[in-house]
């Protein structure tokens, strides 16, 4: 807590300018009017204040706005944002995307800090859903943002927002997250033609059910092995040899290199060996010819 001291004669700040960098902490506290600071926050960023001086300026704003800063101040916080705690930010009501962008810009190039996470959370909750423009902005600053959300949080993403998602935004998503995102993507891209649809939906296919994979095999998509390897194992297992062949097209030869890895390994174990042999890839481990295949799911349903 800075001790309350009177401002020396002639030092009272008339505006926020570079002369203030020569003020000691106690002088800033005594000579800068909080209301003036609030109206001229846009100037603070252009002045090379020390961290200690910024602490004083923050303190003045805290005193002026004990219930939380107004958006007009928040938008121009600049580097002062780095001084804010998550508790400070929880008091804010940020509704403007421009404000969000301005604050994210301050933190650009760094990991998502607790402050930024809190800011985003406040912003999204204020909007009620993660709309396209917001998602566009967030993924531009933090490509992994989408995958940092819980499946429950992702459920509030409207299908229209999916258009803003780039393949790299989904790199760190786990299957549970893709399970939520995939149906939204399918809805968002449903009116696109076959090849264009596949380009857009490809990154989301880790959440696709078997039926959709079978349907994709009808579209001449030639899925690459990297995409195939990210598919849900339980969705791949029921695919027939012919369906996998049609789904992968010329990339089917890549199955050989992946035969020891999931989901290819588990898929091979489900196929009849004579069906696998027809691929001519030397895949081994299928069900030997003449063996009976029991449908255990049917058995469980009956018991």
């Amino acid at each position: 807590e800075v001790e309350k001291t009177a401002c020396p004669s002639g030092k009272k700040a008339r505006e926020i300018d570079e002369s203030l960098i020569f003020y000691k902490k106690w002088e800033l506290e005594a000579c800068v009017d909080a209301a003036l600071l609030a109206t001229q926050m846009d100037r603070v960023n252009a002045i090379p204040f020390t961290y200690e001086q910024l602490d004083v300026l923050k303190h003045k704003l805290d005193e002026l706005y004990p219930q939380g800063y107004p958006e007009s101040v928040i938008q121009h916080l600049g580097y002062l944002f780095l001084k804010m705690s998550p508790e400070d930010i929880r008091k804010w009501n940020v509704t403007s995307l421009e404000t969000l962008k301005a604050l994210l810009e301050v933190n650009k190039g760094h990991e998502m800090s607790p402050q930024v996470a809190t800011l985003i959370d406040r912003f999204v909750k204020g909007r009620g859903q993660l709309d396209k423009d917001t998602l566009d902005t967030l993924t531009a600053f933090y490509p992994g943002y989408l995958c940092s959300l819980s499946p429950e949080e992702l459920s509030s993403v409207p299908p229209s927002s999916i258009w803003a998602v780039r393949p790299q935004d989904l790199d760190t998503c786990d299957p549970r997250q893709l399970d939520v995102l995939y149906p939204k993507a399918r809805l968002a891209f449903q009116n696109m033609n076959g090849s264009e649809y596949f380009v857009k939906i490809q990154s989301f296919l880790g959440g696709a059910p078997t039926e959709d994979l079978k349907a994709l095999s009808q579209q001449n998509v030639s899925m690459d092995l990297a995409t195939f390897m990210k598919l849900r194992t339980d969705a791949v297992l029921p695919l027939t040899v012919a369906e996998v062949q049609k789904l992968l097209g010329p990339h089917v030869e890549g199955l050989k290199a992946e035969e020891r890895h999931r989901p290819v390994r588990d898929w091979i174990l489900r196929q009849r060996q004579d069906d696998l042999d027809t691929l001519g890839l030397g895949l081994q481990g299928g069900i030997p010819n003449g063996y009976l295949v029991l449908d255990l799911s049917m058995q469980e349903a009956l018991s």
């Epitope: 078997t210 039926e211 959709d212 349907a215 095999s217 001449n220 027939t240 049609k246 449908d295």
Partner: antibody, heavy 117, light 107 residues
Framework: EVQLVESGGGLVQPGGSLRLSCAAS????????MSWVRQAPGKGLEWVAT????????YYPDSVKGRFTISRDNSKNTLYLQMNSLRAEDTAVYYC??????????WGQGTLVTVSS | DIQMTQSPSSLSASVGDRVTITCRAS??????LNWYQQKPGKAPKLLIY???RLHSGVPSRFSGSGSGTDFTLTISSLQPEDFATYYC?????????FGQGTKVEIK
């Protein structure tokens, strides 16, 4: 052993409707896409409709689009073809076939549909 | 739509003959070409899929070859039970289309 048995064929007037059924056995019905293929008397084969294993996706050629509807009931292992606004050129033997990726690998014995006044 | 054209439309041959039927696609269909056999009053049966792969239970005298647009079905030594009509079908692109058929008759 895969078995497909069609039923529901018969004589119908132009503009009329008919519903064909196909009872499947010998395989896990809900794992496979299913199709209908027809053959006009003395003519070749023509694909009519395909439905995905869960019934979400359906595919038709232009010749029947909007008039025919393929559906399935996986709990009954049964495939259906609802045919409306029938025309004389729809007269054919209708075959139910299992569809695997790009292959009609097993076929039923067929049911004859005659459209005539 | 992809048109499938078979030739000849019909042929007469004797038991033991080598028979060749060709199928041409109006555009590239990769190797997604299947052959079916149909006997009078019966349903078609799958013989060969993906150009050259024999369906289960099909005798090895049947073989297939080709790629892209031109395909061939060969019966190395015709047997009495092989007299039937043969159809090719492309499975590359919707709508799935069949050739008009080739009838193999006894000479």
């Amino acid at each position: 052993e895969v078995q497909l048995v069609e039923s529901g064929g018969g004589l119908v007037q132009p503009g009329g409707s008919l519903r064909l059924s196909c009872a499947a056995s010998g395989f896990t019905f809900s794992d496979y896409f299913m199709s209908w293929v027809r053959q006009a008397p003395g003519k070749g084969l023509e694909w009519v409709a395909t439905i995905s294993n869960g019934g979400t996706y359906t595919y038709y050629p232009d010749s029947v689009k909007g008039r025919f509807t393929i559906s399935r009931d996986n709990s009954k292992n049964t495939l259906y073809l609802q045919m409306n606004s029938l025309r004389a050129e729809d007269t054919a033997v209708y075959y139910c076939a299992r569809f695997d990726g790009y292959i009609f690998d097993y076929w039923g014995q067929g049911t004859l549909v005659t459209v005539s006044s | 739509d992809i048109q499938m054209t078979q030739s000849p439309s019909s042929l007469s041959a004797s038991v033991g003959d080598r028979v060749t039927i060709t199928c041409r696609a109006s555009q590239d269909i990769s190797n997604y070409l299947n052959w079916y056999q149909q006997k009078p009053g019966k349903a078609p049966k799958l013989l060969i899929y993906y150009t050259s792969r024999l369906h289960s239970g099909v005798p090895s005298r049947f073989s297939g070859s080709g790629s892209g647009t031109d395909f061939t079905l060969t019966i190395s030594s015709l047997q009495p039970e092989d007299f039937a009509t043969y159809y090719c079908q492309q499975g590359n692109t919707l709508p799935w289309t069949f050739g008009q058929g080739t009838k193999v008759e006894i000479k």
